[in-house]
């Protein structure tokens, strides 16, 4: 969480941002909130990006003002106009690109004063893994697949029964470049698995950590997966 204060002759206002990560090809949100004003026409929101000449987005006098918008953001940004009055200056970003990563500044002017806060935005690719029993294999084998990751992640297997065991000798992980030549499909195979055990396939890069669990018994197979973004800090 980053909290910024204004430093002008006017009173300063508190502006709060949250560091976040964008998934390439998906839409992203750059979060920013501020002390609200009672008049929409008195609020100015400017989003800027370090190293970029034009503005990312500007909203003032109750409407978007994009005449100074940088080319890399054209047609890709929007504020939640109906939520500006309650202090939400968050920015929606369409079709996140690797090059959108960087330091952004959310700069606010209201009748109460000015304030700003920076936001670190990371970009990459992350997806939920799915673990299945590979019935085509000669021995009991598990296959963990996740369709889109970038940068290249690490894959670690764990088991509930053999806690702390190192499965690197009995697993094989491959990375296959997807058609857009950036993200990769992750496939990891674990051999010699035993019945009545829960196995976890953990995929992690510097942006996200995802886990796919599978519990294999003689009567059923249960699956569960979850994904967590790393380094979501507020400012």
């Amino acid at each position: 969480l980053i909290i910024g204060f204004g430093i002008s002759g006017r009173h300063s206002i508190t502006v709060t941002t949250v560091a976040s990560a964008g998934n390439i090809g998906e839409d992203g949100i750059l979060s920013c909130t501020f002390e609200p004003d009672i008049k929409l026409s008195d609020i100015v929101i400017q989003w800027l990006k370090e190293g970029v000449l034009g503005l990312v987005h500007e909203f003032k006098e109750g409407k978007d003002e994009l005449s100074e918008q940088d080319e890399m953001f054209r047609g890709r940004t929007a504020v939640f106009a109906d939520q500006v009055i309650v202090g939400n200056a968050s920015l929606r970003l369409k079709n996140v690109q690797l090059t959108d990563a960087g330091t952004y500044k959310c700069y606010i002017i209201t009748s109460k004063g000015k304030g700003n806060a920076n936001l670190e935005y990371k970009t990459g690719a992350f997806s939920m893994p799915e673990v299945n029993v590979d019935y085509n294999a000669s021995s009991e084998t598990l296959r963990c697949e996740a369709p889109r990751w970038f940068p290249q992640p690490t894959v670690v297997w764990a088991s509930q029964v053999d806690q702390g065991a190192n499965f690197s000798e009995v697993s094989n992980t491959s990375f296959e470049l997807n058609s857009e030549n950036v993200t990769m499909k992750v496939v990891s195979v674990l051999y010699n698995v035993t019945i009545n055990n829960t196995y976890s396939c953990m995929i992690e890069n510097d942006i996200a950590k995802a886990t796919g669990d599978i519990k294999v018994t003689e009567s059923e197979i249960k699956r569960r997966s979850h994904l967590q973004l790393l380094n979501s800090k507020a400012s």
Epitope: G25, K63, E65, S67, R74, G75, A78
Partner: antibody, heavy 119, light 107 residues
Framework: QIQLQESGPGLVQPSQSLSITCTVS????????VQWVRQSPGKGLEWLGV???????DYNAAFISRLSISKDNSKSQVFFKMNSLQADDTAIYYC?????????????WGQGTLVTVSA | NIVMTQSPKSMSMSVGERVTLRCKAS??????VSWYQQKPEQSPKLLIY???NRYTGVPDRFTGSGSATDFTLTISSVQAEDLADYHC?????????FGSGTKLEIK
């Protein structure tokens, strides 16, 4: 009330150029981009290009060599010019505006101007 | 270029029937698909944007769904005034592209 209105020549000689003006009201050209789309007789819609609030443009690669879009913010007018027209450029030409500043649907359309390319 | 393939090309339905129009993108377009209704001699009108968001004033019998490559426009109970051409379009990547349209006729 948001409105867009095209005005064009109707008839264009083969190999000549086409100029259409789109006059908008109810919104500012510094807030929203304006898209251009055409529809040939009995055919589907074809996206031609866009001019953004900043004045920068994006064109359909199939038309980039003969298409130019410009605007005058103060007059709320967008200018569309296409060169070297042939018979298969006969179509209704529309200007349109997106629903938001992110392109996710063309919510407002002009009435369209029918352009016939014929000697 | 992303190709948007619409099906069927045309269909004839009775008032009150349920209509399903399909649009398939040649590659992933996330949810950046919109649906338009075009009546004879009129400009297209936006029905659905963002794959599933009904535009202001559009009757709730029109519903959009889908993501990535497969999209559907459903008219739950077709009315006589729904006689029109229906177009899908993608605005995920340049050049923006449209399907060739579905002509809906009322029996």
């Amino acid at each position: 009330q948001i409105q867009l209105q095209e005005s064009g020549p109707g008839l264009v000689q083969p190999s000549q150029s086409l100029s259409i003006t789109c006059t908008v009201s109810g919104f500012s050209l510094t807030s929203y981009g304006v898209q251009w789309v055409r529809q040939s007789p009995g055919k589907g819609l074809e996206w031609l290009g866009v001019i953004w609030s900043s004045g920068s443009t994006d064109y359909n690669a199939a038309f980039i060599s003969r298409l130019s879009i410009s605007k005058d913010n103060s007059k709320s007018q967008v200018f569309f010019k296409m060169n070297s027209l042939q018979a298969d450029d006969t179509a209704i030409y529309y200007c349109a505006r997106d629903i938001t500043t992110i392109v996710e649907g063309f919510a407002y359309w002009g009435q369209g101007t029918l352009v016939t390319v014929s000697a | 270029n992303i190709v948007m393939t619409q099906s069927p090309k045309s269909m004839s339905m009775s008032v009150g029937e349920r209509v399903t129009l399909r649009c398939k993108a040649s590659e992933n377009v996330n949810t950046y698909v919109s649906w338009y209704q075009q009546k004879p001699e009129q400009s297209p009108k936006l029905l659905i944007y963002g794959a599933s968001n009904r535009y202001t004033g559009v009757p709730d019998r029109f519903t959009g769904s889908g993501s990535a490559t497969d999209f559907t426009l459903t008219i739950s109970s077709v009315q006589a005034e729904d006689l029109a051409d229906y177009h899908c379009g993608q605005s995920y990547s340049y050049p923006f592209t449209f399907g060739s349209g579905t002509k809906l006729e009322i029996k």
